[in-house]
Amino acid sequence: DNPERYSTNLSNHVDDFTTFRGTELSFLVTTHQPTNLVLPSNGSMHNYCPQQTKITSAFKYINTVISCTIFIVGMVGNATLLRIIYQNKCMRNGPNALIASLALGDLIYVVIDLPINVFKLLAGRWPFDHNDFGVFLCKLFPFLQKSSVGITVLNLCALSVDRYRAVASWSRVQGIGIPLVTAIEIVSIWILSFILAIPEAIGFVMVPFEYRGEQHKTCMLNATSKFMEFYQDVKDWWLFGFYFCMPLVCTAIFYTLMTCEMLNRRNGSLRIALSEHLKQRREVAKTVFCLVVIFALCWFPLHLSRILKKTVYNEMDKNRCELLSFLLLMDYIGINLATMNSCINPIALYFVSKKFKNCFQSCLCCCCYQSKSLMTSVPMNGTSIQWKNHDQNNHNTDRSSHKDSMN
């Protein structure tokens, strides 16, 4: 049924949308969006589009391979990232705490949701569909999907705000450790993500349906209240607005402010005194920006296919099959790219950050050890950390640089 992290209905029906997670509002068995499990009032099915079965069949196996790869890479990558940040005192700081939060959200999705999804894809049915555990999984699966993407989105926003704050608050002195404000941010992010995912847990139920006289059950969004009906109607736009546009707008705003701040401070002795400091913060900003760009690239195709499905596609149009083939293909590409986002951040950090690269290498070759050379010759932000220097300016600069130890 949702490799993608905001999929909803995870079953399919006998018509055009055999695996397209779109809205087809009066069909037998369903896919992505809420669908009533009855046929149209005239009692007949549309004739299906021939292309859809080819795309669906190919996708089933391609997606299984991709999902298994994402599961392994995501589990190893995110677990390693968490271990690096937990084990290395020098890595425990504001931005890295947010990155750890991001990794934990991805790890939860990868470990719990991906196996359910692969089972659904291969077996063609919901796991434990005839007992209470199946009902529990039906509510847990979309809840964790939404929570995970919410955690990703809000952490990216927090990282963007954090970068701006780091540049705006030049005088801030910070040693090793996670600042209280960051800890509060992380707790708030998780709470808010869980709250925003509650409608999924409420709305998703095991709905029985019949096919050729046989009784089946599928996990799907089934609106039973006015609020859930409203949620169902605005869902695609809400997902696009909050879970996609919002982090991009947030990054754009705070990065613009950060650039202005840096340009305003270009002249004077402070610039000279903080040149290394600026350099390393610029590097951290680049890393965060890189994570946001990757997020945007991973999620854009899926959101675009959703919006096109909502605005352009007409299920009653006799010439809909060509558009459907395009949307199906786009949806499947989007699903895989969106799922890939949950394993790509550790890879991105490995390539963008020297510090993380070294830690990854040593951690994956047994454990991430904190050697002297790592602390001095391979600086966290392009500068070595020299605790012995008692010059006041340097002292402040260096201590504050611990907040930015990513690169």
């Epitope: 399919n12 009692g43 006289g213």
Partner: antibody, heavy 116, light 112 residues
Amino acid sequence: EVQLQQPGGGLVQPGGSLTLSCATSGFTFSSYGMSWVRQTPAKRLELVATISTNGATANYPDSVKGRFTISRDNAKSTLYLQMRSLKSEDTAMYYCATEKGAMGYWGQGTSVTVSS
Amino acid sequence: DVLMTQTPLSLPVSLGDQASISCRSSQNIVHSTGNTYLEWYLQKPGQSPKLLIYKVSNRFSGVPNRFRGSGSGTDFTLKITRVEAEDLGIYYCFQGSHFPFTFGSGTKLEIK
């Protein structure tokens, strides 16, 4: 023993109407989907209608859509096929069949001839 | 519509021989429930069709184990290991995954 009894068919003029019935016994009728399948004189089989266990959902191919209506009476364990605006190409042997993931049991058939 | 192509149209066999009938669908017929609704029916002269195999390879109750169904996606086969006199008739394949459900044109199994 599962039984699907179909009474004898008949000769109908083009444009005319006819209702076929299928009385069942030996199984829980309301637990099965039901279908009507026809076989042309050329021995070609065509599914013409299906109905869900509770009768809420019915499906028809384009060739009969709007002309044929499938219905069921679970209390009487009987299946019906109402045929209107009959054409010469509707001439066939009509079979009722039980549906439970496949058409497991079939009636003996009712011959329908549409001719002027 | 999904076109079901059966080969051969006629299959002359000697009693005790193995018979193999092929059925190819114009589209993949795996249904979204995970099932492939591919069935084989046998119609003996003067009788109504009888279900032999359902969901590609499952024998219906009372069907001898000399009947074996196999295949996936678009290619399906019915094999009769040792043909007996009571096996003679027309064999039809049928797909019930995509509406309108369709039958193959039939394969007549006859004595050589």
